[in-house]
């Protein structure tokens, strides 16, 4: 057991590493190092991560577990998967809401908030792409509605009133004057 920086551990099996005096077997995921082994190729003393903490990987050096993240209620986040000893809480958005990243280069660990999905039905439009990773993509107007400006307007129910060309094409009415 020399004092060099990265000595080879002549231990049966793998996952042994020099921790101070001895080459020790590390701790499994979900456990932290209470004390290194006290003889060559021995087992370290490992304890299960306390509640609300975790360690996702096997390790030789973590003497404490990482605190589980809390989902940001202010950003309308919810826990999709609760924290366990081996995995952090997975935060996301509840059904009907989508992730809006708070930074331009968005990665899985980027801060985000949840936005309510567009309800295409309430806008009298077809749903082209369901809302999940991004907002709902709405399509053309539903039957009985026609494009007018940015919205869908209901077809007239009688021959009274105007029915512009687009209305007439969709609703089957002609302008009656």
């Amino acid at each position: 057991q020399g004092g060099t920086r990265s000595p080879r551990c002549d231990c049966a099996g793998d996952f042994h590493k020099k921790i101070g005096l001895f080459c020790c077997r590390g701790c499994p995921a979900g456990h932290y190092l209470k004390a290194p082994c006290t003889e060559p190729c021995g087992n370290s003393t490992c304890l299960v991560c306390p509640q609300d903490t975790f360690l996702a990987w096997e390790n030789h050096h973590n003497s404490e577990c990482a605190r589980c993240q809390a989902c940001d209620e202010q950003a309308s986040q919810v826990a999709l998967e609760n924290c366990s000893a081996v995995a952090d809480t997975r935060c996301g958005c509840k059904p009907g809401w989508f992730v809006e990243c708070q930074v331009s280069q968005c990665v899985s660990s980027s801060p985000f908030y949840c936005q309510p999905c567009l309800d295409c039905g309430a806008l009298h439009r077809h749903t082209r792409l369901l809302c999940s990773r991004r907002d709902t993509d709405c399509g053309t107007c539903l039957p009985g509605f026609y494009e007018h400006g940015d919205g869908c307007v209901s077809c007239p129910t009688s021959t009274l009133g105007s029915c512009p060309e687009r209305c007439a094409a969709v609703c089957g009415w002609r302008q009656m004057f």
Epitope: G3, T4, L21, S63
Partner: antibody, heavy 121, light 107 residues
């Protein structure tokens, strides 16, 4: 209360033998490594020997290798140091020490009061 | 063997002073370093482990730092009970070795 108490020291002639004992109490002795550390009069600390909790591993300072033997009896909560072929330079207070509270193997957070070994003709 | 060199070998100080003791290892020992305090006729007392962690019950005026080969023990605001000899010890490899000691006495 966690306690280590050494005994067995005394005056011995060069070439003679002595057996030191260390009685442990207040902690689960069989769970912890133990060591002997000595201090010559007016001098600094010198590590002598190490034994793992199960006795499966021992280590010695070069100055005592082949002359001293460390052992333990977990059933009796006792640590021993058999010292043979004693020399004048082995004269020292001998401490038994362990670590029951710290995640640093090879450090010593509990010490006995020491027992004096004098090697002189 | 890893040689541990302490400096100074002695230091005279007054109550309230800040005292700094250094310990140098002859080779890289990561943070596997402990500090002890010893008073005449007594067994050593454990102060600091893994270079910078204070043992429970040790006053916060004691602090340790360092990594690799160079380490420091600092006593900030020396108290009358702190006059003693201090030792560093490496636990990176056998044989375990101690520094020669630093005696802190009254100026």
């Amino acid at each position: 209360e966690v306690q280590l108490v050494e005994s067995g020291g005394g005056l011995v002639k060069p070439g003679g033998s002595l057996r030191l004992s260390c009685a442990a109490s207040g902690f689960t002795f069989s769970d912890y490594y133990m060591s002997w550390i000595r201090q010559a009069p007016g001098k600094g600390l010198e590590w002598v020997s190490y034994i793992s909790s199960s006795s499966s591993y021992t280590n010695y300072a070069d100055s005592v290798k082949g002359r001293f033997t460390i052992s333990r009896d977990n059933a009796k909560n006792s640590l021993y140091l058999q010292m043979n072929s004693l020399r004048a330079e082995d004269t020292a207070v001998y401490y038994c020490a362990s670590n029951v509270d710290t995640a640093m193997v090879g450090a010593f957070d509990i010490w006995g009061q020491g027992t004096l070994v004098t090697v002189s003709s | 063997d890893i040689e541990m060199t302490q400096s100074p070998s002695s230091v005279s100080a007054s109550v309230g002073d800040t005292v700094t003791i250094t310990c140098r290892a002859s080779q890289h020992i990561s943070n596997w370093l402990a500090w002890y305090q010893q008073k005449p006729g007594q067994a050593p007392k454990f102060l600091i482990y893994t270079a910078s962690n204070l043992q429970s019950g040790v006053p916060s005026r004691f602090s340790g730092s360092g990594y690799g080969t160079d380490f420091t023990l600092t006593i900030s605001g020396l108290q009358p009970e702190d006059f003693a000899t201090y030792y560093c010890q490496q636990a990176d490899s056998f044989p375990l070795t101690f520094g020669g000691g630093t005696k802190v006495d009254i100026k």
